[in-house]
Interface confidence: low
């Protein structure tokens, strides 16, 4: 898979492959994988990819199922790159406060908050 | 501040306090703080709260500015609690795949993806 494929297209293709291979992936009935208990997915990327690793290690590889896991590893690469960009640029307090305000605004309107 | 205040109310109050104290907070013109260069805020919570710590250490405390930083530390506590819940429950592969599909779906529709 060329890594030049836009990440948005990669995500779409991965969703399709996930549906295609669902039956194969759920074949192991004894396996248990940690699943986050809330919907703030971005907070849980490490655990999600750990679970993907668990799943990959016990799934017979070959054909498009291999492509599914390759895609997922490229998505992880993208997210790791995004995480790197969290602290790369030093700016004035003003700009930091803009970002903080935006973060709290998103938390206020979009997060699923259980008190 | 009683920690019993619902997190959603805490976030709203913090947004208001941030506006109130903006002038005081930007007084230090030489300070530089790492600011994420993308809008997937949840990926950057660690860096955001590090920046808040930097800001707090150089802001004259007292009155409601103290309340602002107290609120922010309670919000951090809430987020840390959410992060703990990322890997606490082991479920069947089926349920993990549901979560993964949901995560990719959110990534597909809500993330700001630059390729």
């Amino acid at each position: 898979i060329p890594t030049e494929i836009p990440t948005s297209a990669l995500v779409k293709e991965t969703l399709a492959l996930l549906s295609t291979h669902r039956t194969l992936l759920i074949a192991n009935e004894t396996l248990r994988i940690p699943v986050p208990v809330h919907k703030n997915h971005q907070l849980c990327t490490e655990e999600i990819f750990q679970g993907i690793g668990t799943l990959e290690s016990q799934t017979v590889q070959g054909g498009t199922v291999e492509r599914l896991f390759k895609n997922l590893s490229l998505i992880k690469k993208y997210i790791d790159g995004q995480k790197k960009k969290c602290g790369e640029e030093r700016r004035r307090v003003n700009q930091f406060l803009d970002y903080l305000q935006e973060f709290l605004g998103v938390m206020n309107t979009e997060w699923i908050i259980e008190s | 501040i009683p920690t019993e205040i619902p997190t959603s109310a805490l976030v709203k109050e913090t947004l208001a306090l941030l506006s109130t104290h903006r002038t005081l907070l930007i007084a230090n013109e030489t300070l530089r703080i790492p600011v994420p260069v993308h809008k997937n805020h949840q990926l950057c919570t660690e860096e955001i709260f590090q920046g808040i710590g930097t800001l707090e250490s150089q802001t004259v405390q007292g009155g409601t500015v103290e309340r602002l930083f107290k609120n922010l530390s309670l919000i951090k506590k809430y987020i840390d609690g959410q992060k703990k819940k990322c890997g606490e429950e082991r479920r069947r592969v089926n349920q993990f795949l549901d979560y993964l599909q949901e995560f990719l779906g959110v990534m597909n529709t809500e993330w700001i993806i630059e390729s």
């Epitope: 396996l31 248990r32 940690p34 490490e46 655990e47 990819f49 750990q50 993907i52 690793g53 668990t54 990959e56 290690s57 016990q58 590893s73 992880k76 | 890997g87 606490e88 429950e89 082991r90």
Partner: nanobody, 132 residues
Framework: QVQLQESGGGSAQAGGSLKLSCVVS?????????MGWFRQAPGKEREGVAA????????YYADSVKGRFTTSQDNATSTFHLQMNSLKPEDTATYYC????????????????????????WGQGTQVTVSS
């Protein structure tokens, strides 16, 4: 059927040594996995002592055992060891080995304090008692 069997527990004097072993059999997955050593003292929560990825890389040690405990492995026999030196009375606990097929995706095996809930397979435990 995956089985983990610990051995090597027993009694020791403070300052003494013990070597625990864990044999993994029936592991159904190809490739490497995360191996963890945990302990649980009476009335306390199970805590991570050491963890490492069997394919290599760093090993995590709890602060309380750093410099005293070391892990090793014998790939040919799928046996894992926990060498415990300079034992202290507070090391008294039931010790468990655990395995889970994390791949390097997670990245945190051997780096972070291992969460017991992240491990699929467990041994039955071996008792270690350290007297002063």
């Amino acid at each position: 059927q995956v089985q983990l069997q610990e051995s090597g527990g027993g009694s020791a004097q403070a300052g003494g040594s013990l070597k625990l072993s864990c044999v993994v059999s029936g592991y159904p997955y190809s490739g490497d996995y995360c191996m963890g050593w945990f302990r649980q003292a009476p009335g306390k929560e199970r805590e991570g002592v050491a963890a490492f990825y069997t394919g290599g890389g760093s090993t995590y040690y709890a602060d309380s055992v750093k410099g005293r405990f070391t892990t090793s492995q014998d790939n040919a026999t799928s046996t894992f060891h926990l060498q415990m030196n300079s034992l202290k009375p507070e090391d008294t606990a039931t010790y468990y080995c655990a395995a889970d097929p994390w791949s390097v995706y997670g990245g945190s095996c051997g780096v972070k304090d291992p969460n017991p809930k992240a491990f699929n397979y467990w041994g039955q435990g071996t008792q270690v008692t350290v007297s002063s």
